[in-house]
């Protein structure tokens, strides 16, 4: 299911890097979140629960990430103009059932003021 543009601020710039915010409903207990740049998988994070409600977090394509009860943040550093692109949060929900996939995204504009190492 493609939902189109994120209806929240998806990109937060700081210190020459960007935090890409991927939100999900807090009812969701087990999921996989992928960050796509165009059609390429940049990062992923999978949260599962085992017996006794033990939480497991796994990444096949590791990026610096941060998990809260309703979002995953992926951090990209050393921004340059090549980072400008469409980015998508690809959420696969395992629990609660049924399995659902939803895609939200936006375009990352890179301005000179956001670059990490500007030439003086």
């Amino acid at each position: 299911e493609i939902n189109g543009s994120a209806n929240y601020e998806m990109f937060i710039f700081h210190n020459g890097g960007v935090q890409i915010l991927c939100k999900y409903p807090d009812i969701v207990q087990q999921f996989k979140m992928q960050l796509l740049k165009g059609g390429q998988i940049l990062c992923d994070l999978t949260k599962t629960k085992g017996s006794g409600n033990t939480v497991s977090i796994k990444s096949l394509k590791f990026c610096h990430s941060q998990l809260s009860n309703n979002s995953v943040s992926f951090f990209l550093y050393n921004l340059d103009h090549s980072h400008a692109n469409y980015y998508f949060c690809n959420l696969s929900i395992f629990d609660p059932p049924p399995f659902k996939v939803t895609l939200t995204g936006g375009y990352l504009h890179i301005y000179e003021s956001q670059l990490c190492c500007q030439l003086k």
Epitope: N3, A6, N7, V28, P96, T102
Partner: antibody, heavy 125, light 108 residues
């Protein structure tokens, strides 16, 4: 008019098999998660099985390993293959559909808003 | 498994009266509760989803409330066609999807 029409019910001996079908019309079948719910005469509703839009399947403990749910979106059809039938499986079987929509932080569940008229399965012991 | 309990089991009222039906869940299901009406020989009909949202075509006299574990279906002024069996149902903690045992609303 939105319609679900079940068929395939009937009388079968204990240990036998039946295949129930449900034909959908006038709604976007492939956007619905589909379920089978049964009801023994004079009793309450019991959920049996479900299949998601992605083909993921779910079963109640009482039918797991004996029943198989499937869907054919191109034909707007839902199926329930029932085997190793028992007297306790005797009931009216309804097919029904519901929708879940995820948008950002919102998780919307719209309820089982389409139902068939039911088909009767009788298992003779 | 989430167990749903409905009470009363039977409710005897007259047309024009207000009906209050209750459903209690064994654990927190937030607002993911639906109400159904079923008449003899017919399939169930969705009345309320998300605890308080009326389904398409359902008259305004039907309303739902509650969240967490305690839910209520209210029929503000009973019409003759409202006498039936009412079920609550949850589908957030599953499988299995569970239904309550039902409340029979009968004419006094």
């Amino acid at each position: 008019e939105v319609r679900l029409v079940e068929s395939g019910g009937g009388l079968v001996q204990s240990g036998g098999s039946l295949r129930l079908s449900c034909a959908a019309s006038e709604f976007i079948f492939n956007s619905y998660d589909m379920h089978w719910v049964r009801q023994v005469t004079g009793k309450g509703l019991e959920w049996v099985s479900a299949i998601g839009t992605a083909g993921d399947t779910y079963y109640s403990d009482s039918v797991k390993g004996r029943f198989t749910i499937s869907r054919e979106d191109a034909r707007n059809s839902l199926y329930l293959q029932m085997s190793s039938l028992r007297a306790g499986d005797t009931a009216v079987y309804y097919c029904t559909g519901d929708r879940t929509v995820v948008r950002g932080v919102n998780y919307y569940y719209y309820g089982m808003d389409v139902w068939g008229q039911g088909t009767t399965v009788t298992v003779a012991s | 498994e989430v167990v749903l309990t409905q009470f009363p089991a039977t409710l005897s009222l007259s047309p024009g009266e207000r009906a209050t039906l209750s459903c209690r869940a064994s654990q927190n299901i937030r607002s993911y509760l639906a109400w159904f009406q079923q008449k003899p020989g017919q399939a169930p009909r969705l009345l309320i989803y998300g605890a308080s949202n009326r389904a398409t075509g359902i008259p305004a006299r039907f309303s739902g409330s509650g969240s967490g574990t305690d839910f209520t279906l209210t029929i503000s002024s009973l019409e003759p066609e409202d006498f039936a069996v009412y079920y609550c149902q949850q589908r957030i903690s599953w499988p299995p999807i569970t239904f309550g045992p039902g409340t029979r609303l009968e004419i006094k």
